[in-house]
Interface confidence: low
């Protein structure tokens, strides 16, 4: 008996060919002997089968011997046997209709699980693989399941359905929604102007949900809601915005934030959060801002960082085209009595500069200045 | 199949008003951002204005700002430019557009454009 | 405003060949990591057509011949292999700041 493995709403041509290449009397049959459709001269006739309106044939094919049975948006229950009748003879066609759906919707917050759903027919014992775009493989019976989805997932899931030594594949479309970084951090001099962003990692035609900036600043006790804001149809409205730092955020995607002045006292990281509007859970953004200060007091030229920088990062003092005169794994350094010229303040890592300020010493008679 | 039309074109006077009209189908207008762009005969392509898809924010130029009103009717699916004050640096083919985005806004669909002439 | 220079102004070419159209911002049109830069084509009477978004997004529709490129101030639009309807005028355009602004065109003709 021929095995053909159907998709739940696809369509399925099941064929039979008769030894005449020519027109003959045919039918078509369930495994209740209940006629689906045959013909009649050249007209085709339907039987009372719950397939009536679904059932189809190919006329243009009948002339060559052909008399295959067409059934058009297949369901689980139009599993069985189909048997063919011509010549006298009778050809059986197992039919197995398969359907994979995710649990949810197919937008999933980042974090979140992924469950897939195998509907099969009774009696059958299919086996299912899954790869994700990531390249990812996951095996399972009814039921597969992916928990903390992550960005990489975002895509088209293949799963291939495998009974009978014959396969069928299903495509499905996962949208993790999630900014595009965990994590950002920005590097400024005291009074730069700093720019913060929040990209998103996925495009929808609608975009409504609310969010908030918590800032947690080095110097602070406790954190701190910065601004909230409600989005809606990928438009920004500010709600609320603390009184200082006097921020300013963009009307529209992505997210963006504008901090006039970078000062020691705003260094340290933020928490943006963004409920999307019919999903539980937040989708969620840090940011961090480590802020640079060199000044020269008296006969001490010091250099400071403030924020959350990692203990690989090099702090160094160094006159313009001269070696380092202090290099520390630390977040102030300085130097007594610094000789005239431009002095230069570098933050680093392994050998890249993240941030750099610039303090020109005047002999010691005048006042410094600060390009 | 998203389409824009836009009317209301033709030739007027120096610091006269023409109202050009937008027609949009094929899309849920109410969920887009929509602009006008104009073009200059043998010129390139300047933005004028854009409104919010609700209608609540708008943006204009600064040769326009005070000048043209960019508004919309969604529940007539149609979008508007009223010019007054026109002057003859505002002759030009009036494009309406629909502002998309993913990162940046763009837009992503066009009218076929009706050409305003200033003249005395 | 944020002003674009598009080079060349106009451009010969034949069938086949890969071409190059560059466009400078005047100040960086990034935020964060995002370029606000899209390419649109434009034929004689007709209306722009949106190829690029976001420096390198391939527009949906748009032929894999046309590639975008660059990052900060610096982008480029490519044809890898012109083909006959693709000799137009060619705009790039910002969207970091209100006003929007467009480069003032490359003319592509056959040669």
């Known amino acids: 008996k021929k095995v053909v493995l159907g998709k739940k709403g696809d369509t399925v041509e099941l064929t039979c060919t008769a030894s005449q290449k020519k027109s003959i009397q045919f039918h078509w049959k369930n495994s209740n002997q209940i006629k689906i459709l045959g013909n009649q001269g050249s007209f085709l006739t339907k039987g009372p089968s719950k397939l009536n309106d679904r059932a189809d044939s190919r006329r243009s094919l009948w002339d060559q011997g052909n008399f295959p049975l067409i059934i058009k948006n297949l369901k689980i229950e139009d599993s069985d046997t189909y048997i063919c009748e011509v010549e006298d003879q009778k050809e059986e066609v197992q039919l197995l209709v398969f359907g994979l759906t995710a649990n949810s919707d197919t937008h999933l917050l980042q974090g979140q699980s992924l469950t897939l759903t195998l509907e099969s027919p009774p009696g059958s014992s299919p086996s299912v693989q899954c790869r994700s775009p990531r390249g990812k493989n996951i095996q399972g019976g009814k039921t597969l399941s992916v928990s903390q989805l992550e960005l990489q997932d975002s895509g088209t899931w293949t799963c291939t359905v495998l009974q009978n030594q014959k396969k069928v594949e299903f495509k499905i479309d996962i949208v993790v929604l999630a900014f595009q970084k965990a994590s950002s951090i920005v590097y400024k001099k005291e009074g730069e102007q700093v720019e913060f962003s929040f990209p998103l990692a996925f495009t929808v035609e609608k975009l409504t949900g609310s969010g908030e900036l918590w800032w947690q600043a080095e110097r602070a006790s406790s954190s701190k809601s910065w601004i909230t804001f409600d989005l809606k149809n990928k438009e920004v409205s500010v709600k609320r915005v603390t009184q200082d730092p006097k921020l300013q955020m963009g009307k529209k995607l992505p997210l963006h934030l504008t901090l006039p002045q970078a000062l020691p006292q705003y260094a340290g990281s933020g928490n943006l959060t963004l409920a999307l509007e019919a999903k539980t859970g937040k989708l969620h953004q840090e940011v961090n801002l480590v802020v640079m200060r060199a000044t020269q007091l008296q006969k001490n030229l010091t250099c400071e960082v403030w924020g959350p920088t990692s203990p690989k990062l090099m702090l160094s003092l160094k006159l313009e085209n001269k070696e380092a005169k202090v290099s520390k794994r630390e977040k102030a350094v300085w130097v007594l009595n610094p000789e005239a010229g431009m002095w230069q303040c570098l933050l680093s890592d392994s050998g890249q500069v993240l941030l750099e300020s610039n303090i020109k010493v005047l002999p010691t008679w005048s006042t410094p200045v600060q390009p | 199949e998203v389409q824009l039309v836009e009317s209301g074109g033709g030739l007027v006077q120096p610091g006269r008003s023409l109202r050009l009209s937008c027609a949009a189908s094929?899309?849920?207008?109410?969920?887009?951002?929509m602009a006008w762009v104009r073009q200059a005969p043998g010129k390139g392509l300047e933005w004028v204005a854009t409104i919010s898809y609700d209608g609540s924010i708008t943006y204009y130029r600064d040769s326009v700002k005070g000048r043209f009103t960019i508004s919309r009717d969604n529940s007539k699916n149609t979008l508007y430019l009223q010019m007054n004050s026109l002057r003859a640096e505002d002759t030009a083919v009036y494009y309406c557009?629909?502002?998309?985005?993913?990162?940046?806004?763009?837009?992503?669909?066009w009218g076929q454009g009706t050409l305003v002439t200033v003249s005395s | 405003d944020i002003q674009l220079t598009q080079s060349p102004s106009s451009l010969s070419a034949s069938v086949g060949d890969r071409v190059t159209i560059t466009c400078r911002a005047s100040q960086s049109v990034s935020i964060s990591s995002h370029d606000l830069m899209q390419w649109y084509q434009q034929k004689p009477g007709k209306a722009p057509k949106l190829l690029i978004y976001?420096?390198?997004n391939l527009a949906s529709g748009v032929p894999s011949r046309f590639s975008g490129s660059g990052s900060g101030t610096d982008f480029t639009l490519t044809i890898s292999s012109l083909q006959p309807e693709d000799f137009a005028t060619y705009y790039c355009q910002q969207s970091k700041d209100d006003p929007y602004t467009f480069g003032q065109g490359t003319k592509l003709e056959i040669k």
């Open positions: 094929g899309f849920t207008f109410s969920n887009y951002g």
């Open positions: 976001d420096a390198f």
């Open positions: 557009a629909r502002e998309e985005q993913y990162s940046s806004w763009y837009f992503d669909f």
